[in-house]
Every structure is written in C-alpha cells, then in structure tokens.
Interface confidence: low
C-alpha cells in the first residue's frame, strides 16, 4: 500500500468493571478493542470501515497500560494500512469489548459485550508526529496516540509519489523526502539514468556508459575524443573528418602519396624538354625534336624529323644528313622545283597555281593533305596539342583531345571540379580527387555516390575482413573496419600494394 | 485516458509456453517504450523485458533471456511476451506498462495484470 494509519493505545481504565448497558463484568472486564477507519463523515455512521479495520487480542483487564510490541499477536501500535491517496481527512471509531472467551481470537467468541466506543472525526496530515489524545465517559478513560505514515517508496503530502531508490541499468538514484530522485554522484537526467563524461570529452565524438569515462565514437581518439583519424594509408594528409585524407600541399592521390611538384623537386627530364606537373607518373616529359623516351633521354635519327621536301629521301651522315631530291626537285631539303603546272605536279587532287611567270608553281592543296606536292597525309597529332595528358585522335579532316579525367576544354587546358555536378547524393561531402569525385556519405549511407541506404546492423553480417575490427557508427546502420597492420581498403579485404575499392564508409 | 489490458495468461506445464498481449489505448502507441513486469506472491516485482518505441531496442531480464521473446504491432496498439520453455518459477502476475516515452525507463502506467501459472 502507499500509506499506513497507526494508532498506538497507551492506556485504558474501567475501573468499576462494568460494561456499556450497566452490568459488572464477572470476575472483571477482559477487554479487547476493536477499530474501524472510513472517510470522513459528520455525522459517524454504521457500514464498512472504507479505510480498514483491525481487531486486537485481550490485553488486559478492567483498566491497564498497553505496552508497545512490534511483532506478533498483540501488536501495538495497531497498523491500518491502505493503498491509495491519503485525503488528509478521516472517522476513527475505537470501541472496548469484553471476552469471556479466547484470549488472542475474542473476536470469534460469542457472548462479547461492549464496554464503551469513542469516534473521532477530523483531519490529519501525513507526518511522523504522533496526535495525542484522551477520551471520557462515565465509567471509562482511553489515551491514545494515532498518525499516518507513507509505507516505504512512498513519498509526498498524500504518499501518493512512488519513488524507489536504485543502481542499475534503468536508473542511479535516492529519494528524496518529496519523492523526488535525487541522482547519485557521476549520473543525471531525469531518471539519473545519463552518466556524467569525462570533463571535457566532447559531446558529439565521445561519450560514456557510465561515469568519468569517455568512450570515442568510430573515426575520432584521443583522451576527450577530439582528434579525427584519418583513412587508413593516408600519406601526406590529415583530416578534419573521420576517415578523411586531405592532402597537404604538394601531395594527391587518394592516400596523398603522389608528388604533385615532381618536376621541381626531382628535375626528370632531359635535353631540355619540357616538364608538366600531370600524367599517371605525376610528371610528364615532352621532348625537343630530335629526343624520344620517357624523360626525353633517347637521340633520335637526324633524318627523323623528316627534313627533304617534295618526296625527297633521307640519308643519315656523321653529324647532319642529306637529301637525295626527285626529279624536277633541286636544293639542301629538295625545296626547289624545276616543274612548272603543265608537269602536274600536285598529287592527291590539289589544283596547281602558276607563279614567277610561270616559271614555277604552288599547290593548293584539298582537306586532309599536306606538302608541296600535297604528297603528304595530314597528321593533326605531331604537334602534341592536347595538355595534361590528353590522348590526341585523328578525326577525318580534323583532331580532338580526349582529356584525362579532371579536364577539359579544346585541348584539356581546363581544370575541372568534379564536385561542380554534385554527385554525392543524402548530403554527402564531396571531394576532388585526382582520379576523379570521391564521396563522404553521412551515417546510414553508402555506395560511390552515398545512393545506397543502409537499414540493417551493419555489423552484423561481418563485414570485415583479415581480422579487422568492425565499429557501428552513431546509428546502427554504417560501419567502418578498423584494418590490422599490412591490410587496407574500406572492408580490410586488400593485401598492402593492391588497390583497394575506395568507399570511405562501407 | 491511459488503458493497457494484458491477456493470455493461464495454467501451463512445465516446458510448456504462453503468449501473453498488451492493449494498449488512450495514447499515441508508437511513440511509447512498452515493458513488462512480473510480481509472485510476497515477492518483489521483478523487470523481464522492454521494447523501444520503434522496436529497435530490447531489454531482457537474465531470468528470462533466451526463452522469452518481446515484439510490437504498432498497427494493432499491442505488445506481445512469448513464453517459452516456462518454469515453475515463472509463476506470477504479468503485467505490462510503459514510461510514457521513447526509451525504456521508469514506469507511468501499468495494466491491471493476467495471471501466469506454471505447474504439472
């Protein structure tokens, strides 16, 4: 029950013996009391004792002391407890009965008779501070003490608050005299069931189950959970964010090990050719006539450069070259002709023009023909006219660059973002890299472009390989494998020095 | 107002199993934790399990883990308790109640219980 009514009897006396109607007790009045608690009512009436009742044994005769006893048949102070809100209102009826009978169950006996009854009618508050009073008849006195009580876990002016103190999973805390919780050292919230951190463990990365400890969400360490770590096998970067590599100048790549400055810090090319910052190397070379190779370190044939004009042939000597000229052809690069336009000189549909007299010529010559002869097939891509490493393709009378990813323009001399189209879907954090957008998904997201939804633990299935940790993130629905030293990639699945699939959260 | 009804309890053999239901009424179902409780005859009441408000968390109590099973149809406003392998020692008042939140933490309001009764 929420509440219990104690009334303490302290003393009885009749001491003529007798009882209610006039009659004298033989050979004195064993008496026996009976108490009945109901609402309050004005005008005391017989029906249940809505409150509870209680009956005691004999507990003396004619007129006696009543002792307190705590246990056992003859409890005093008599307990009437309920369950419910105490109204603060009350009747008590208190009446004395004699019994020629059984001592310890007079109620059962038949021919008990009453001796005298008091009602009291008022009010009383919940406290622990006894009422005292005494009652009067003609023939009796009855001192008596009475108040109520909350039963324990019960608290307030009505005992109506239930609090019961606990240390376990569903809360940390004592009760107040109101019933109000009172947490326990290192706990908070409402129901005390929130530990308190460590001081200073920050409040997104970190957190605790139980007090003064400071536990770091996947992606972030340190002693207050405020330090980033970055992807596995980042090189050159650092992170602002979990999992990120973000490269320190002069680095790229995806893991930031690729020297972007190469051709200043290494100097590869050779023979005065040219060195850009670009290609799958991060360097590339692009040589002066004459040089081959990958650093322009190879001499080429001095005839490779195609020097005779007109159809004339080639041949290498020690230190120069010379051209054997057709006829009709004169000079050091054939570049002299003794025809005129009544020769038909020009080849491949190219219309002649008379000049100096007729005395020579020139040829003006159709698409895709070259030469003064137009003897020669145009070849668009000698001039090497597409940067940053695009791939130069023949296109009938024409040529166009194919750009390497990142670049574009007529011949790739534009840088472009990746990131300009927006290609991370549910809010992902783009990032340009060298081989192209790479995408941070939020927690509960996946896939190359955060398009995939995860709604399973996604720790559940194992997905982490070669003995790596697997981490749920600050929802249930992302993971990240923690890899073992000499693994790599987001499940932990490559050998270091195969390239790993690049999610940066599975 | 506030109404959790609990059924299915009754008489079973050891090793047997019960299903026990909690309708629930007078408030938005799904918004709440549901838990259940059990109290034996001049014992304590004793915590067995709880269901978050999405069903994505759940509580049992080591008594009963592994043999009892929580689950919510938050179409139909009811929260299950499925029994299994019960014991002597599981005889007692179910009863069911949530904290009027989220999460499974304290008690607000309770049912007036279903008598589970374990015996050969």
């Known amino acids: 029950g929420s509440g219990i009514f104690q009334l303490r009897l302290q003393e009885f006396v009749n001491q003529r013996g007798m009882l209610a109607n006039g009659q004298s007790c033989e050979p004195g009045c064993r008496t026996f009391f009976r108490i009945c608690l109901k609402h309050f009512q004005a005008t005391f009436s017989e029906g249940p004792c809505t409150f509870g009742n209680v009956s005691t044994p004999v507990l003396g005769t004619n007129s006696f002391v009543v002792r307190d006893k705590n246990s056992g048949s003859g409890r005093n102070p008599l307990q009437l407890p309920f369950n419910f809100t105490w109204p603060g209102t009350f009747s008590l009826n208190i009446q004395a009965w004699h019994t020629p009978g059984d001592d310890l169950r007079p109620e059962t006996s038949p021919g008990n008779s009453l001796i005298s009854q008091i009602i009291i009618q008022g009010s009383l508050a919940v406290g622990k501070i006894w009422r005292t009073d005494e009652q009067n008849d003609t023939l009796t006195r009855l001192s008596y003490s009475y108040r109520v009580i909350c039963s324990d876990n019960y608290y307030g002016e009505s005992c109506s608050r239930l609090c019961k103190k606990r240390d376990d999973h569903f809360g940390h805390y004592e009760c107040q005299p109101d019933g109000s919780l009172s947490c326990l050292p290192g706990w908070t919230g409402k129901y005390c069931d929130q530990p308190i951190c460590l001081s200073g463990c920050h409040e997104q990365n970190g957190y605790c189950s139980k007090p003064d400890e400071c536990i770091c969400r996947p992606g972030w360490q340190g002693r207050l959970c405020n330090e980033c770590i970055p992807h596995n096998g980042c090189r050159h970067g650092t992170c602002s964010i979990p999992w990120q590599c973000a490269c320190d100048e002069g680095w790229g790549g995806l893991f930031c090990d690729q020297d972007l400055n190469y051709c200043t810090h290494h100097s590869p090319c050779k023979n005065g050719s040219t060195c850009s910052n670009s290609g799958p190397k991060g360097y590339t070379c692009t040589c002066l006539p004459g040089y081959t190779g990958e650093h322009c370190e190879l001499g080429l044939s001095k005839c490779a450069s195609n020097p005779c004009r007109n159809g004339g042939s080639c041949k290498d000597q020690e230190n120069s070259y010379h051209c054997l000229c057709p006829p009709g052809y004169y000079g050091q690069h054939c570049e002299h002709s003794t025809l005129t336009c009544a020769d038909s000189p020009c080849f491949n549909g190219g219309s002649c023009r008379e000049r100096n007299q007729g005395s020579s010529y020139a040829c003006e010559c159709p698409p895709n023909f070259t030469g003064s002869n137009c003897e020669k097939k145009v070849d668009r891509c000698t001039s090497n006219p597409c940067a940053n490493g695009g791939q130069c393709q023949n296109r009938g009378p024409s040529r166009t660059c194919r750009c390497r990813p990142g670049f574009t323009g007529t011949h790739c001399e534009l840088h472009i973002s990746d990131c300009a189209r927006s290609p991370c879907a549910h809010g992902g954090t783009c990032h340009d890299l060298e081989n192209g957008p790479v995408c941070t998904c939020p927690a509960g997201f996946s896939g190359r472009r955060c398009e995939v939804r995860i709604t399973h633990d996604a720790c559940a299935s194992g997905p982490c390989f070669n003995g790596a940790t697997c981490y749920t993130g600050l929802s249930p629905n992302n993971f990240v494998c923690n890899c073992p030293y000499g693994f790599v990639g987001s499940r932990c699945e490559f050998p270091v020095g195969l390239p790993p699939s690049f999610p940066w959260v599975a | 107002e506030v109404q959790l009804v609990e059924s299915g309890g009754g008489l079973v053999q050891p090793g047997g199993s019960l299903r026990l239901s909690c309708a629930a009424s007078g408030f938005t179902f799904d918004d709440y934790a549901i838990g259940w409780f059990r109290q034996a005859p001049g014992k304590e009441p004793e915590e067995i399990s709880c269901i978050s408000s999405s069903g994505g968390i759940t509580y049992y109590a080591d008594s009963v883990k592994g043999r009892f099973t929580i689950s919510r149809d938050n179409a139909k406003n009811t929260v299950y308790l499925q029994m299994n392998s019960l014991k002597p020692e599981d005889t007692a008042v179910y009863y069911c109640?949530?904290?009027?939140?989220?999460?499974?933490?304290?008690?607000?309001?309770t049912g007036q219980g279903t008598q589970v009764t374990v015996s050969s």
């Open positions: 109640a949530t904290p009027g939140i989220a999460a499974c933490r304290g008690i607000h309001y």
